[in-house]
């Protein structure tokens, strides 16, 4: 349904925002972030940017936990003014708001490289999983701010980016187990040569690089002050985060692949996977670690790296054609990505134009089918689900600010590759 | 705030040419779908065509096909409509249209004042 | 082409009375139907798009109404200022097509 525009709005990690507000974004593991402030802005769109500190003139700057920005003694505010932040108990050890920390045995299914990242916000602990960089040197150092150890010298995980910089909302707070699958972290504060400004997203062949693993993807968990326990389903001795979805193990079947469960906050709530009655092709074949019978041929040509379970299914969520058209003329590029929707039937066209690598406009159109097919240009590049399309939309609304400010080249590309269904290492989703 | 600009009026012989303007302002030209349409007196509506700035990619309505052709000029975001071998048919205003707030592509919510032709002997 | 069918041709209304213009369209458009006041001697202005969305300004009096065919334009309250020529037209496919319009008049 289209949102009237007298009342538009922003959607931000599932809140909704008047046109106008300003706000400090939460991001696990972090919480909330004081040196990031977002905006809502009049096209709905959430504009979030690093605040920029100004030079302070005295010896001994004092830190002050919700203020961004480091002041002089003599400019502090007065005492009985100051916000206080709730503090979190975790494990039998009190942590002050903003600290962060190092917790063991929250995740049963951790990686040999990978650590929990926990931080205190405003009374709750995030923790995450982080998939730590291959080190390069004998003894690694820890350091205050990141689980992972680092080699000295090396730039550890830090939110001290260059002045102005645009941090990306991490889109997708329902955490998933397919580690390096469309998620955001915050960028290294000095990127490895060739690393991707969109660490998470896939290429076209659906091949994960080497320098893409080092940033890996921080899955969300909340664990309430009250309640001690995580916001976590386990099944079969596996940790499952909320939103996050899998296919049950049952010792006298194994894995269950028409049945998907989710994990809504600590219950699982399991269903069956409905396969189509009829198939666009005669003679469907039935394979291995799918639920429903596939057609053979075309399809996995036209579209590499990717599984569905039938015409329009992968890991039991509806798929959509996503297509793509790029016109240059006159040093500009236009860019153009095409969602097409059966709910409502239409086509929704997201245009950027870019010139000498800067944008110099992003906007969307939304169209009727018959209107597109009409347009010259378009191919269709892949299928995606309406979750990996809200990850995009999201990632779009950063880059559309970042690159309007300074020289992008390759991030719109990067951040189509959200698009791109790929199956998860072992073949399951 | 969002501007398109027309001259007011023409005065034409029959068989010439015209070539009506609309500046846009307050937004990015290279944007936004420019539509034209022409309206006779005590009539409706009709859609001349539309034209993309950014790539100059064009949809015409079949019955203006011969008659109308809409180019632009991105350097100073102006769009064009030429009309040629003019008859009294196509004594009319000529509105140029934009969409800017709507996002429904055909939804014009920007409108030039409107130029009236006027094709007399 | 999609044809656009607008009845009735004129209407006269009093203030405070609720007026309902109709719209019919020659085959299934969708939600692709926008509505259009145009006064006298003036440029039209968008009222609704996508059918049943109220543009940015336009007083809440205006509701537009339908999908597929048939559409409607409810004026729950009607204006001296409303006097006007009401247009609807299609962005389903090109051509664009807008009805012949309704002009309301206001007693």
């Known amino acids: 349904e289209q949102v009237k525009h007298s009342e538009t709005y922003c959607m931000f990690q599932d809140k909704k925002y008047r046109v106008g507000e300003r706000w400090h974004p939460y991001l696990e593991p972090y919480g909330l972030v004081y040196c990031v402030n977002c905006i809502c802005s009049e096209n709905g769109n959430v504009l979030c940017s690093r605040v920029r500190c100004p030079n302070v003139h005295c010896l001994s700057p004092v830190h002050i936990p919700h203020l961004c920005c480091p002041r002089c003694p003599d400019s502090l505010p007065p005492v009985n003014n100051k916000v206080t932040s709730k503090s979190c108990e975790y494990n039998g050890t009190t942590y002050q708001h903003g600290e962060l920390f190092v917790a063991e045995g929250l995740f049963q299914n951790r990686q040999p490289n990978q650590c929990t990242q926990c931080s205190c916000s405003e009374g709750n602990v995030y923790c995450g999983l982080k998939t730590c960089p291959k080190l390069t040197c004998a003894f690694p150092v820890s350091v205050p701010d990141s689980c992972c150890r680092v080699c000295r010298g090396d730039g550890e995980l830090s939110w001290e980016h260059s002045d102005g910089d645009i941090f990306r909302q991490p889109a997708n707070r329902e955490a998933r187990h397919s580690y390096h699958r469309s998620h955001y972290d915050p960028p290294p504060s000095r990127q490895a040569g060739g690393l991707s400004r969109f660490p998470g997203a896939r290429s076209h062949r659906g091949a994960l690089m080497d320098s893409q693993q080092a940033s890996g993807t921080i899955v969300q968990i909340v664990i309430n002050n009250k309640h001690k326990h995580g916001q976590v389903c386990v099944s079969n001795g596996k940790t499952y985060s909320h939103g996050e979805s899998w296919h049950p193990n049952l010792r006298a079947f194994g894995i269950v692949e028409c049945v998907l469960c989710t994990c809504n906050v600590t219950k699982q709530e399991c269903k069956k996977i409905h396969c189509p009655n009829r198939y666009p092709c005669k003679y469907p074949q039935k394979i291995d670690g799918k639920c429903c019978k596939v057609c053979p041929g075309k399809k996995a040509k036209e579209l590499p790296g990717q599984s569905f379970d039938n015409k329009g299914y992968f890991c039991g969520e509806e798929t959509m054609p996503v297509y793509e058209s790029v016109f240059m003329e006159d040093g500009e590029t236009t860019r153009k990505i095409a969602l097409e929707t059966e709910r409502p039937p239409q086509v929704e066209v997201h245009v950027w134009t870019i010139r000498k690598g800067i944008l110099q406009h992003f906007h969307i159109e939304k169209i009727s089918k018959r209107m597109f097919e009409e347009l010259p240009h378009f191919k269709l590049v892949t299928r995606t689900t309406l979750s990996q399309w809200k990850i995009f939309t999201e990632g779009e609304a950063q880059i559309s600010q970042m690159c309007s400010s300074r020289v992008c080249r390759t991030e719109l590309e990067d951040l189509v590759k959200v698009l791109y269904l790929e199956r998860s290492e072992k073949g399951h989703c | 705030q969002v501007q398109l600009q027309q001259p007011g009026a023409e005065l034409l012989r029959p068989g010439s040419s015209v070539k009506l303007s609309c500046k846009a302002s307050g937004y990015t030209f290279t944007t936004y779908w420019m539509h034209w349409v022409k309206q006779r007196p005590i009539q409706g509506l009709e859609w001349i065509g539309n034209?993309?700035?950014?790539?100059?990619?064009?949809h015409y309505n079949q019955k203006f096909k011969d008659k109308a052709t809409l180019t632009v000029d991105k350097s100073s975001s102006t769009a064009y409509m030429q009309l040629s071998s003019l008859t009294s048919e196509d004594s009319a205003v000529y509105y140029c249209?934009?969409?800017?707030?709507?996002?429904?592509?055909?939804?014009?919510?920007?409108w030039g004042q409107g130029t009236s032709v006027t094709v007399s002997s | 082409n999609i044809v656009m069918t607008q009845s009735p041709k004129s209407m006269s209304m009093s203030v405070g009375e609720r007026v309902t213009l109709s719209c019919k369209a020659s085959e299934n458009v969708g939600t692709f139907v926008s509505w259009y006041q145009q006064k006298p001697e003036q440029s039209p202005k968008l009222l609704i798009y996508?059918?049943?969305n109220r543009y940015t300004g336009v007083p809440d009096r205006f509701t537009g109404s339908g999908s597929a065919t048939d559409f409607t334009l409810t004026i729950s309250s009607v204006q001296a200022e409303d006097l006007a020529d009401y247009h609807c037209?299609?962005?389903?496919?090109?051509?664009?097509?807008f009805g012949a319009g309704t002009k309301l008049e206001v007693k």
């Open positions: 996508g059918a049943s």
């Open positions: 034209i993309d700035p950014s790539d100059s990619e064009t």
């Open positions: 249209a934009s969409y800017y707030g709507s996002s429904y592509v055909g939804s014009m919510d920007y």
């Open positions: 037209g299609q962005s389903y496919s090109f051509p664009l097509t």
